[in-house]
């Protein structure tokens, strides 16, 4: 008879991440007799959630089990139903909660509670929403892309998973960027620290590794854009504010109630002369360059060298995983690949930027305009927080690599999240076990 | 655990100044916004401002507007608030407590006399 | 300004039984569904400490017989049965907007 495959143990594991502009849930699987194995955690789906962040929920609650619905509905098709009441799901929260908690505790807590109340509706083995930290959120995002990368697994393979992974054990740096926060995580070559809240230790597969790490909150793409519009707004002469960052040609009105909504704006508030202003496009990127730079505070370090606002960044080591909203923005403006030089990066930002709003419209017909509107600032802002505020140079650049996917999952924090909370990740190197998980009669 | 420890004791003379410290630890300094409240003898509490560490945006109540200055040093995660010009009616406790809304936890508070 | 008026000023309780405080705001203290509203208890020499938060929310280690109810501009705090260690001063107090107010204090003692 022909040999046949016993089918195999598969377990699953969903995992929410509520960001601030919007929530995506990512469903996990992996061969249940190897889960202490470095890479055998892959993503086999990713749902968006239609709508904005459950932040935005805050003065309609009870919309949140509708906005879920979708999603967890496809989890519950993905998913064998024999496998539902084993599978547990978490949902963390980010930048938007943090920022909302920062305004209120309440609203914060009220908006948890409703989405926990949904949640606990499925058949799943639900483990609880929480607002995470800054530290965590970097540390899951380092620990899922070196796990993709296979940086933990002690056997050296003699092929490469994909294009840049050297056969080198040295960790990958992770750089996050979503709307409202923004990471930088890595394996300093000091390991001494001079700030102890930038520094993690972990044992993973047997291995020590002393991980910097920290989390600019209101340095996410959104939340530096309505940095620089309050920022701008204060020296401008009258209700129009002629940007730079902005396609030349472009038009918007924004309310000056929405632009201080926001801890992020607190410190450019003051009490304008009108209700609304219009942003008017002029698409410079040089000028975009410069305002955004006046977002970072160079001038004040307590340490031996600073990112930026006091914040201390010991010397930058290593390759980097750029992911989220890097991967995102770097990708719709083309300029992913390897080959692409700063320089040119920058010479590709400059056209960009300047070419006319009607003309940047009709070329990308499919792109919601709300989005299509804020590459050239997002593109510049990129730039700015990676030269500037992170310190990589013409040079270093080439060891940033923006990245989308790894091995068909997702960069980013949630795969790590669940990795740590299912105790995937052992601190010592397992036991190789002579058998495969398939197993043939 | 979150604990906020202020500076010590201060005497004052009319027209000077003060500043009382408030020194966090056991949670993300930058992740909430820091409160000043004060009492005078016998009196209820008065709030007299915010600051959001993150980015030191502060917010007053009218009463304490061009008088009082709050700051941080967010490597110290520490909070300061200095107030000017005294008056014998300045004369109270200055607590600072965490919070967005909540004023879930308080420092010791900081006793401050003005006296000629 | 929301104004925040305390009743009564003061209240002798016997141990055991029931202490009733009420606040009563100017105008509402609701906001998205939530109460912006907050008990405190301070003794003597001591920051106060918070009891109920968003109305009728428990405190950390806040005991069971302390409860807050109410919405919109009327708020009770209630403590079921009184023990000695409650005599202190309780304040009332709202966040829903600046400047955040507080009220004048309510003093109890035991009777």
């Known amino acids: 008879t022909q040999n046949k495959a016993l089918p195999e143990n598969i377990k699953y594991g969903i995992v929410l991440d509520a960001g601030s502009s919007h929530t995506s849930l990512y469903i996990y699987k992996w061969p249940a007799e190897k889960e202490n194995d470095t890479g055998v955690v892959h993503q086999v789906e990713e749902c968006r959630v239609k709508g904005p962040g459950i932040s935005k929920y805050v003065q309609k609650v009870n919309e949140i089990g509708i906005y879920l619905t979708d999603c967890m509905e496809r989890a519950r098709e993905v998913i064998p139903r024999s496998q539902h009441q084993e599978t547990p799901v978490y949902l963390g929260a980010t930048a938007g909660m943090r920022l909302l908690r920062m305004e209120s505790e309440e609203l914060a807590d009220r908006v948890l509670d409703v989405v926990e109340r949904s949640l606990s509706n499925y058949p799943f083995d639900f483990q609880g929403a929480r607002i995470i930290t800054g530290q965590e959120e970097g540390a899951y995002g380092w620990i899922t892309i070196n796990y993709l990368l296979g940086k933990f697994s002690q056997k050296t393979r003699w092929f490469s998973i994909v294009p840049y992974e050297t056969n080198n054990q040295e960790t990958f740096g992770a750089l996050d960027l979503g709307g409202a926060s923004t990471q930088i995580t890595f394996v300093p070559q000091n390991q001494t620290t001079e700030s102890p809240d930038n520094a993690l230790q972990f044992r993973l597969y047997g291995k020590d590794y002393n991980v910097y790490t920290h989390s600019f909150l209101c340095y996410g793409k959104d939340q530096a854009l309505w940095q620089k519009l309050a920022k701008d707004i204060q020296v401008a002469s009258n209700e129009i504010l002629r940007d730079p960052c902005f396609h030349p040609g472009y038009k918007k009105v924004v309310n000056v109630s929405d632009l201080y909504k926001t801890p992020c704006t607190k410190r450019f508030e003051m009490t304008l002369p009108f209700q609304q202003f219009e942003i008017q496009g002029i698409g410079n990127y040089q000028q975009c360059h410069q305002s955004v730079l006046e977002l970072f505070n160079t001038s004040y370090c307590p340490y031996s060298q600073c990112a930026f606002n006091g914040i201390f960044l010991p010397p930058l080591q290593g390759d980097f995983g750029a992911f989220s909203a890097f991967y995102f923005v770097m990708n719709f403006l083309n300029l992913t690949s390897e080959k692409v030089s700063q320089e040119k990066v920058t010479e590709m930002m400059k056209k960009f930027c300047s070419q006319p709003w009607e003309e940047i419209k009709t070329s990308y017909a499919g792109v919601k305009e709300k989005y299509l509107s804020e590459y050239c600032f997002s593109g510049t802002y990129i730039l700015s927080l990676l030269l500037q505020g992170y310190h990589f140079t013409a040079d270093s650049w080439e060891h940033i690599h923006f990245i989308g996917k790894i091995q068909g999952s997702d960069a980013g924090w949630t795969l790590g999240y669940m990795l740590n909370l299912t105790n995937m990740i052992p601190a010592e190197q397992p036991l190789s076990t002579p058998l495969s998980h398939s197993t043939y009669v | 655990q979150v604990q906020l420890v202020q500076s010590g004791a201060e005497v004052k003379k009319p027209g000077a100044s003060v500043k009382v410290s408030c020194k966090a630890s056991g949670y993300t300094f930058t992740d909430y916004n820091m409160h000043w409240v004060r009492q005078a003898p016998g009196q209820r509490l008065e709030w007299m401002g915010y600051?959001?560490?993150?980015?030191?945006?502060?917010t007053f109540s009218q009463k304490f507007k061009g008088r009082a200055t709050i700051t941080v040093d967010t490597s110290a995660s520490t909070a300061y608030m200095e107030l000017s010009s005294l008056r014998s009616e300045d004369t109270a406790v200055y607590y600072c407590?965490?919070?967005?809304?909540?004023?879930?936890?308080w420092g010791q508070g900081t006793l401050v006399t003005v006296s000629s | 300004d929301i104004v925040m008026t305390q009743s009564p000023d003061s209240l002798a309780v016997s141990l055991g039984e029931r202490a009733t405080i009420n606040c009563k705001a100017s105008e509402s203290v609701d906001n998205f569904g939530v109460s912006f509203m907050y008990w405190f208890q301070q003794k003597p020499g001591q920051p106060p400490k918070l009891l109920i938060y968003?109305?009728?929310n428990q405190g950390s280690g806040v005991p069971d017989r302390f409860s807050g109810s109410g919405s919109g501009t009327d708020f009770t705090l209630t403590i079921s049965s009184l023990q000695a260690e409650d005599v202190a001063v309780y304040y009332c107090q709202q966040t829903k907007e600046v400047p955040y107010t507080f009220g004048g204090g309510t003093k109890v003692e035991i009777k």
């Open positions: 968003g109305a009728s």
């Open positions: 407590a965490r919070g967005g809304t909540r004023f879930a936890y």
């Open positions: 600051i959001v560490p993150l980015n030191g945006g502060s």
